[in-house]
Interface confidence: low
Amino acid sequence: NWVNVISDLKKIEDLIQSMHIDATLYTESDVHPSCKVTAMKCFLLELQVISLESGDASIHDTVENLIILANNSLSSNGNVTESGCKECEELEEKNIKEFLQSFVHIVQMFINTS
């Protein structure tokens, strides 16, 4: 499932190349392993901004599919409680390209520990 999430992220990267979306997104670029689920939820929350800003049906569908895949993967880990993690709005704001790169890194972290 996480591998498919990366495929969708790459697809989103390709789709936004032709668009001018100047949104900045809350981005965790240095994810601590004990906060990875919290960070992932922030990424999923902010991903909806890309869908909203783009107004593009293909991006919307890909984002929707990615979120479902990620949620399925998260729930297969069971209910993980993390504490002392940053709130989404405490994270640094970065452009979409950097956001997607950091998103790929956190997904790889999940792949490496699954």
Epitope: Y26, V37, K41, L45, E46, Q48, V49, L52, E64, I67, I68, A70, N71, N72, L74, S75, N77, G78, N79, V80, T81, E87, C88, E89
Partner: antibody, heavy 118, light 107 residues
Framework: EVQLVQSGAEVKKPGESLKISCKVS????????IGWVRQMPGKGLEYMGI????????RYSPSFQGQVTISADKSISTAYLQWSSLKASDTAMYYC???????????WGQGTLVTVSS | EIVLTQSPGTLSLSPGREATLSCRAS???????LAWYQQKPGQAPRLLIY???RRATGIPDRFSGSGSGTDFTLTISRLEPEDFAVYYC????????FGQGTKLEIK
């Protein structure tokens, strides 16, 4: 079309238990958080807590921690708010709402009126 | 916990006038996480503004939001009869807080 349909009004006695529901349709249930909001008669909105149906992660407002239980059943796209022992002060309208873009509440249920009286 | 204080508690204006509602936070709030809701008697609240200044789907352009840090404003440029209601601000994101509300009534 996104819809949140809540269960009907309830009249209960102090000390009784209760579970009210919020059935969603029109979107993928696991994609968004679902929050619960209390509104006591003639008063403002009070945030109670929120659940992420994707993995059942649940967060409570400090005021409601230990007073209620929020849960969700992915198989029937339904969120719940539960009391084990009602008090007269629980008399209120309770709303469920979807945490949409950036997690603000973009769609709301019609509300469930809970009356607790001896 | 962040406290949101709305003012005035009640605002009396005539249709056609401009309404300015204030929401002040006890500590700085990211503008991406500030919303405004409208609630009419016997109805559920309705989202008007999110991200401090973005209008929700279907909301008329006479509603606008602004502000940053600790001070946020909802402006209704030309009051229509259906705009008289209670308005709430909300800080959302990882934690949620509502203001106590401002009642907008017909003068």
């Amino acid at each position: 079309e996104v819809q949140l349909v809540q269960s009907g009004a309830e009249v209960k006695k102090p000390g009784e238990s209760l579970k009210i529901s919020c059935k969603v349709s029109g979107y993928f249930f696991t994609t968004y958080w679902i929050g619960w909001v209390r509104q006591m008669p003639g008063k403002g909105l009070e945030y109670m807590g929120i659940i992420y149906p994707g993995d059942s992660d649940t967060r409570y407002s400090p005021s409601f921690q230990g007073q209620v239980t929020i849960s969700a059943d992915k198989s029937i796209s339904t969120a719940y708010l539960q009391w084990s022992s009602l008090k007269a002060s629980d008399t209120a309208m309770y709303y469920c709402a979807r945490g949409g873009n950036w997690n603000c509440f973009d769609y709301w249920g019609q509300g469930t009126l809970v009356t607790v009286s001896s | 916990e962040i406290v949101l204080t709305q003012s005035p508690g009640t605002l009396s204006l005539s249709p056609g006038r401009e309404a300015t509602l204030s929401c002040r936070a006890s500590q700085s709030v990211s503008s991406s996480y500030l919303a405004w809701y409208q609630q009419k008697p016997g109805q559920a609240p309705r989202l008007l503004i999110y991200g401090a200044s973005r209008r929700a789907t279907g909301i008329p352009d006479r509603f606008s939001g602004s502000g940053s840090g600790t001070d946020f404003t909802l402006t209704i440029s030309r009051l229509e009869p259906e705009d008289f209601a209670v308005y709430y601000c909300q800080r959302y994101g990882s934690s949620h807080t509502f203001g106590q509300g401002t009642k907008l009534e017909i003068k």
